[in-house]
């Protein structure tokens, strides 16, 4: 009886198991009642990082120095380059597609620490009783407007992206 | 396009003064924080001083507190940097740049040579 499923490293096809090809190679031919699967190293440039029944091999990435990149890492048949940016600057994600020269602090997020040549910005939530409402790479958190200070009574309460609204206290006639 | 053009550098004597500005387009200026980053020869980037976006706001790096003085002109898409009490550590290469700095929007900048 034909399987329903296979074993680790294995792929189904035609009612029948065929082996998956190695990280670092790609599927040629599907194996048959008589003979193995065929699997083909990638080329040059090229990688498959997984055990794998893909035709063609990926492409590994670019190090584009027109967006600051540089390899960190050079690839080979079964891992991607990685890149990283250029000294005193910093990637805008985890993939480092492109360099900026620092991270903003969202709203709601002050500096806690400015960038430098080696580390970037560090943000902070705003605590209770704080805000920012703006992107920014060297402002801090600002602490709510004291209403008492100017004899007026809170209207609206602060959050973290927010100040108070001062307003008239009600007189008592 | 993205475009930061610096002038205003030169050579100068250590005590000297001198004015940076940067004009910039292909943005809405008036928006934007804004920042003067400068590098030393054979020395990694400095951040020097930053502004918000109307003016209000600035920072200063400590090497730099209380002889820099940052400013800009919304209306004339222009931010400016005033140099006193210059010192031959300033000499740099001064860069302006908007927030956030793409890589590919660095401008070329403008030397600052401090010297007698």
């Known amino acids: 009886e034909p399987p329903t499923a296979c074993r680790e490293k294995q792929y189904l096809i035609n009612s029948q198991c065929c082996s998956l090809c190695q990280p670092g190679q790609k599927l040629v031919s599907d194996c048959t009642e008589f003979t193995e699967t065929e699997c083909l190293p990638c080329g040059e440039s090229e990688f498959l990082d997984t055990w794998n029944r893909e035709t063609h091999c990926h492409q590994h990435k670019y190090c584009d120095p027109n967006l600051g990149l540089r390899v960190q890492q050079k690839g080979t048949s079964e891992t991607d380059t990685i890149c990283t940016c250029e000294e005193g600057w910093h990637c805008t994600s985890e993939a480092c597609e492109s360099c900026v020269l620092h991270r903003s602090c969202s709203p709601g997020f002050g500096v806690k620490q400015i960038a430098t040549g080696v580390s970037d910005t560090i943000c902070e939530p705003c605590p209770v009783g704080f805000f920012s409402n703006v992107s920014s790479a060297f402002e801090k958190c600002h602490p709510w407007t004291s209403c008492e200070t100017k004899d007026l009574v809170v209207q609206q309460a602060g959050t973290n992206k927010t100040d108070v609204v001062c307003g008239p206290q009600d007189r008592l006639r | 396009e993205v475009q930061l053009l610096e002038s205003g550098g030169g050579l100068v004597q250590p005590g000297g003064s001198l004015r940076l500005s940067c004009a910039a387009s292909?943005?809405?200026?008036?928006?934007?924080e804004m920042w003067w980053v400068r590098q030393a020869p054979g020395k990694g980037l400095e951040r020097v001083s930053a502004i918000n976006p109307q003016g209000t706001r600035t920072y200063y790096a400590d090497s730099v507190k209380g002889r820099f003085t940052i400013s800009r002109d919304n209306s004339k898409n222009t931010l400016y940097l005033q140099m006193n009490s210059l010192r031959a550590e300033d000499t740099a290469v001064y860069y302006c740049a908007k927030l956030p700095t793409y890589f590919k929007d660095w401008g070329q900048g403008t030397l600052v040579t401090v010297s007698s």
């Open positions: 292909g943005f809405t200026f008036r928006d934007y």
